[in-house]
């Protein structure tokens, strides 16, 4: 996939901070309110953020220009350097005004066929269960294959580099094509399947790329929100795979959620499966010690955890996925669309 | 510590109305959902009504439709039961419950009870 | 409407057993489900939830498995404060309560 570059997105925040930079007073305010980052801890949703009034005028005056509203790409290049412009000029939208994050990802929906030869998993024996087809898929494709390696080396041994590991994780869930990399990781599996479960939960490498003793959920969060990479993926996530209402409704499309979601992984957020019998998702963390702020962790654990937005979403990408298998194609190389199963 | 405190129970006649209220404490209560959900004397548990931790959604048992509304306030921390049109099926303790996660009906905490009993 | 039919409706067991009760519910609603224990006169308390977790505080001889339409609820050795009457409930869709196992003593 080509990565979108800047005119290909709407009002991007590099592009927006050019412009800003042109202009004698617009850059003075952003490197103002830049500067005004060591003052202004970014409050946790329990906390009350305090401000000195010198950073409510330079975030004042940041909020006529075209920074306000300027967004990001997931697959952009310079992604990083996109997201530390988007959070400086987010606190000019929310400063004495403190409001829910929003996501700094512009929707782009990809509706590229996605083609697949399926006449080359001949050499998988028949009954093989629908995760080995999937990471067979992967293999039979350059890129998939390349980047699959990349990580799975640098997440296996027993001194592997949990940074390391992340990085390529990461790498590889932004770079694959999305249904490569949804196939690989939302296989279905039959509910007795135990080792098709396994191999899905260990499709992460979890054993690398989990912290050893889980920590504190509240903790991971804030070590999440001090990346701008991390906060942005959480963001995205929290935004996209919000339940509406108390039957669990995607507050927007499925797909939008199941994006976001495989977006979190490499993060210090990554969630995985919780066992190999089920498909219930979870965070690698604990509420154990959270003190007055339990409640607080609860929500944040039970969004990953206790969703039922993100687990019909999983759910209906996997009878996607068993269907692609399950239906008898006119020819052994079919498309399928990326987008198929929004809602 | 979590506390519901139900009161506005009684005996009230076929047809008549009632206002059941529960003060809540000890949580966040904007950010959950609550619900009321009765039970005969001696018998098992009905959902009757929910509403969303902003009280821009409620849900009604189609048993309750049309007929009761329920609805909260924020600032005071209180949820509301307003039964209309009672029925002699409506003889309950009603409980006013708190839901563990705001997106669904699983409750963790629950008030005591209050009794309403429609009888002529 | 999601119908939870519960069995047995009442089950005589003595101190020391392992007693396990079932849930079907009438479709499947995934794992989204709770159990409760009730005491005479008082307000259910939630043991299980999402099918296996237990809630905190909630001793650990309480176990809940099961995952479509068949779940189970079983206490690996029953204590005396855990004569009571207990209630499945699914939460996939609305809420509906099982019709609830009385649990006594032999």
């Known amino acids: 996939d080509p990565l979108p570059t800047e005119s290909r997105l709407m009002n991007s925040c590099l592009q927006a901070r050019r412009k800003c930079q042109a202009d004698p007073t617009c850059s003075a305010a952003y490197h103002h309110l830049d500067s005004c980052t060591s003052s202004i801890s970014t409050p946790l949703p329990s906390e009350e953020p305090s401000v000195p009034a010198d950073c409510l005028e330079a975030a004042q005056q940041l909020r006529n220009s075209s920074l306000i509203g300027c967004m990001c790409h997931r697959r952009m290049k310079n992604q990083v350097a996109c997201l530390d412009i988007y959070w400086t000029v987010h606190r000019a939208r929310s400063l004495g005004n403190y409001e829910l994050d929003v996501s700094p990802y512009e929707d782009t929906v990809t509706s590229k066929p996605w083609k697949m030869n399926l006449s080359k998993l001949n050499m998988l024996k028949p009954d093989s269960d629908l995760c080995l087809k999937f990471a067979m898929l992967c293999t039979l494709n350059d890129k998939c294959d390349r980047l699959r390696k990349a990580y799975g080396e640098a997440c296996s041994g027993p001194h592997c580099q949990r940074h390391v590991c992340l990085r390529q994780l990461l790498t590889f869930f932004e770079k694959a094509a999305e249904p490569h990399a949804q196939g690989l990781l939302l296989c279905p599996c039959a509910p007795n399947d135990r080792g098709c479960g396994e191999r899905r939960r260990n499709t992460i490498a979890p054993n690398c790329a989990l912290p050893p003793v889980a920590p504190n959920c509240l903790e991971l969060r804030r070590l999440c929100f001090s990346d701008p990479l991390c906060r942005s993926r959480l963001v995205d996530f929290q935004t996209h795979c919000h339940p509406m209402d108390i039957l669990g409704t995607c507050a927007t499309e499925q797909s939008r959620c199941l994006r976001a979601y495989l977006g979190l992984i490499g993060t210090a957020m990554t969630p995985n499966f919780v066992s190999n019998v089920n498909t219930s998702v979870a965070l690698s963390c604990t509420c154990r010690g959270s003190g007055n702020l339990q409640e607080e962790c609860e929500m944040l654990e039970g969004f990953f955890s206790h969703n039922p937005c993100l687990t019909e979403a999983i759910a209906a990408k996997m009878r996607f996925h068993s269907q692609l298998f399950s239906q008898d194609w006119p020819h052994p190389t079919f498309a399928v669309m990326a987008h198929q199963n929004e809602n | 510590e979590v506390q519901l405190v139900e009161s506005g129970g009684g005996l009230v006649q076929p047809g008549g109305s009632l206002r059941l209220s529960c003060a809540a404490s000890?949580?966040?209560?904007?950010?959950?959902?609550m619900s009321w959900v009765r039970q005969v004397p001696g018998k098992g548990l009905e959902w009757v009504s929910a509403?969303?931790?902003?009280?821009?959604?409620?849900y009604n048992a189609e048993s309750v439709k049309g007929r009761f509304t329920i609805s909260r306030d924020n600032s005071k921390n209180m949820l509301y039961l307003q039964m209309n049109s009672l029925r002699a099926e409506d003889t309950a303790v009603y409980y006013c419950a708190k839901t563990k996660f705001s997106s669904s009906l699983l409750f963790d905490y629950w008030g005591q009870g209050t009794l309403v009993t429609v009888s002529s | 409407d999601i119908v939870m039919t519960q069995s047995p409706s009442t089950l005589s067991a003595s101190v020391g057993d392992r007693v396990t009760i079932t849930c079907r519910a009438s479709?499947?609603?995934?794992?989204?489900l709770a159990w409760y224990q009730q005491k005479p006169g008082k307000a259910p308390k939630l043991l299980i939830y999402k099918a296996s977790s237990l809630e905190s505080g909630v001793p650990s001889r309480f176990s809940g498995s099961g995952s479509g339409t068949e779940f189970t609820l079983t206490i690996s050795s029953l204590q005396p404060d855990d004569f009571a009457t207990y209630y499945c409930q699914q939460y996939n869709s609305y809420s509906t309560f099982g019709g609830g196992t009385k649990l006594e003593i032999k």
């Open positions: 479709q499947s609603i995934s794992w989204w």
């Open positions: 509403i969303s931790g902003s009280g821009d959604n409620t």
């Open positions: 000890g949580f966040t209560f904007s950010s959950y959902a």
